[in-house]
């Protein structure tokens, strides 16, 4: 066959559908690859062709649109299953062509089984609700286009395995499920089962999503630096290891990027002539507030390093904060010698700080390792 623009296998769209339920799958060409829609293509005389490769097979074959009760059909740019079967799993290709033009894309379709409690290998979307925030709703997802607006389906909501009836703060309202006030105890998987009639048959659509109760924007604050702080002094002798943790608490904020970084003498550690290692760890609370810790480490600290300014910075959508660590050179304890007893004074006192290379004062032309 002549050349065809092949967009390959679009693994970004791992389409999963439940066995024995209707599924409508739009050809991804018009949504993600081409600059025109199906109507334009159709009126320009282009034809949309569907074929598939079964799971664990290499052979492309046409889709059988002559199955009993039109189990598989095509309508405009949509491939319909009424309903799916387990062995419909495979890679599906839609191709748009005429005598002079051709473009195609493949995508994987997985038909999955669920148990009586709606457990399955299906990847679940996560919906975040703010804790103790007032009325919030979730909506039964991906049911548009399955039935006309004249059809009134019945919708049943479940939390885990249990039908939602007479729950204190959770009220089913058709396609919506309302949380009068959300608590941590509302975390879990919620399923809506939509039942609708079509041509004398009854179909069910099952949609499960995970509800995660997160910190409320009402309680959100700018980042809080717990360490370094004014109560801890990092007192070291040259040659010792300097370890300074920067521990920052971030309130949960939807779509906020939380950042923590160190500066040394106002510069990125990479631009300072010392061997610095920075290791980061992140932990989350039950409401997804985040604590980030970045430990700055200098294996063998020098007198010059003990004069530098070590500042931990943090930023979120709520603001930016910074805190300097108090780093000092340990003053050697006086040696109690005979001279001291005789009144000549200690021999080992003083700050013990040699004069550093003046070029290191504010200069940073050397390089070091930064992990």
């Amino acid at each position: 066959s002549e050349r065809c623009d092949d967009w390959g296998l679009d693994t970004m769209r791992q389409i999963q559908v439940f066995e024995d339920e209707p599924a409508r799958i739009k050809c991804p060409l018009f949504e993600h690859f081409l600059k025109f829609n199906y109507s334009t293509a159709h009126s320009a005389g282009l034809t949309l062709i569907w074929y598939w490769t079964r799971q664990d097979r290499d052979l492309e074959e046409p889709i059988n649109f002559r199955l009993p009760e039109n189990r598989i059909s095509k309508e405009k740019d949509v491939l319909w299953f009424r309903p799916t079967l387990l062995n419909d799993t495979g890679n599906y290709t839609c191709m748009l062509r005429n005598t002079t033009y051709c473009s195609k894309v493949a995508f994987p379709l997985e038909v999955v089984q669920k148990d009586s409690c709606f457990n399955s290998p299906m990847k679940l979307p996560v919906h975040k609700l703010y804790i103790e925030y007032g009325i919030q709703r979730i909506t039964c997802p991906n049911v548009d286009g399955y039935f006309p607006s004249s059809v009134k389906p019945t919708i049943t909501w479940y939390m885990g395995c249990y039908k939602i009836q007479n729950f204190n703060n959770v009220i089913p309202e058709g396609m919506n499920l309302s949380f009068l006030i959300a608590f941590i105890s509302n975390n879990g998987n919620y399923t809506c089962v939509v039942t609708y009639p079509e041509n004398g048959r009854t179909f069910h659509l099952t949609r499960t999503l995970t509800v995660k109760v997160v910190g409320s924007p009402k309680n959100a604050v700018p980042p809080v630096i717990h360490s370094p702080n004014d109560h801890v002094v990092y007192e070291k002798e040259p040659g010792e290891e300097l370890l300074i943790p920067c521990t920052v608490y971030f309130s949960f904020l939807m779509d906020s990027r939380n950042e923590v970084w160190w500066t040394i003498d106002g510069k990125k550690p990479d631009d300072i002539p010392i061997d610095v290692t920075i290791n980061e760890s992140i932990s989350h609370s039950r409401t997804e507030d985040e604590t980030r810790t970045q430990i700055l480490s200098i294996k063998k600290v020098t007198s010059e390093d003990l004069k530098r300014s070590y500042v931990c910075h943090a930023r979120s959508a709520k603001g930016e904060v910074a805190k300097a660590a108090t780093v000092k050179q340990k003053v050697p304890a006086p040696r109690y010698t005979v001279e001291l007893a005789c009144g000549f004074g200690a021999t080992g006192g003083g700050s013990g700080k040699p004069i550093p290379n003046p070029l290191l004062g504010l200069d940073s032309t050397h390089h070091h390792h930064h992990h």
């Epitope: 106002g266 510069k267 530098r308 500042v311 300097a324 780093v327 700080k353 504010l362």
Partner: antibody
Framework: EVQLQQSGAELVKPGASVRLSCTSS????????MHWVKQRTEQGLEWVGR????????QYAPNFQDKATITVDTSSNTVYLQLSSLTSEDTAVYYC??????????????WGQGTLVTVSP | DIQMTQTTSSLSASLGDRVTISCRAS??????LNWYQQKPDGTVKLLIY???TLHSGVPSRFSGSGSGTDYSLTISNLEPEDIATYYC?????????FGSGTKLEIK
């Protein structure tokens, strides 16, 4: 509240020396490098040098190596700038300042009100 | 030494205007640049450090940007109290150096 109080204006003769003072309050002077800059009339700022009050270690801009001496008296929270062999080129306002963060931070957040030095016969 | 050039020595603008003050370094200074404001009475304040970080207490109408050798300070909505001279300052290499200043006046 962080404050830097500088000494009053000085009128000095060419060839003489002058010592300017900068007394800090609201923070421990030992925790911050203290800096001086020079500003000639209608001109930009020129960094003179700095001192680590913890141990008295100093650093100067090359142009001021033989002109300026910075000292500190931690008991009175005061930093001094001594200028020697004065010429008309040294006529300027001199500012002391403190960084934003502990130690040798290069973000100069707190400034004194400036001291005018006039060198005139 | 790194030379900091503020080509516009004075600038006249109307209240409410958006004003941009520029500063050029004689070599790449890796964003290690601060901006200061000096009021007519000589008072000096840090406005922005590390190119774009607003110092606490500085109004959000001030912003900084730039990279490499070219940097700018923008005042989005000029207020009467913004009448001052603005200095850039690099701390990439020793010794730290300042621009010659841009004096901002009201039309």
């Amino acid at each position: 509240e962080v404050q830097l109080q500088q000494s009053g204006a000085e009128l000095v003769k060419p060839g003489a020396s002058v010592r300017l003072s900068c007394t800090s309050s609201g923070f421990n002077i030992k925790d911050y490098f203290m800096h001086w800059v020079k500003q000639r009339t209608e001109q930009g700022l020129e960094w003179v040098g700095r001192i680590d009050p913890e141990d008295g270690e100093t650093q100067y801009a090359p142009n001021f190596q033989d002109k300026a001496t910075i000292t500190v008296d931690t008991s009175s929270n005061t930093v001094y700038l001594q200028l020697s062999s004065l010429t008309s080129e040294d006529t300027a306002v001199y500012y002391c300042f403190r960084p934003l963060y502990y130690g040798n931070s290069p973000w100069f957040a707190y400034w004194g009100q400036g001291t005018l030095v006039t060198v005139s016969p | 030494d790194i030379q900091m050039t503020q080509t516009t020595s004075s600038l006249s603008a109307s209240l409410g205007d958006r004003v941009t003050i520029s500063c050029r370094a004689s070599q790449d200074i890796s964003n290690y640049l601060n901006w200061y404001q000096q009021k007519p009475d000589g008072t000096v304040k840090l406005l922005i450090y590390y190119t774009s970080t607003l110092h606490s207490g500085v109004p959000s109408r001030f912003s900084g940007s730039g990279s490499g050798t070219d940097y700018s300070l923008t005042i989005s909505n000029l207020e009467p109290e913004d009448i001052a001279t603005y200095y850039c300052h690099q701390y990439s290499k020793f010794p730290p150096t300042f621009g010659s200043g841009t004096k901002l006046e009201i039309k």
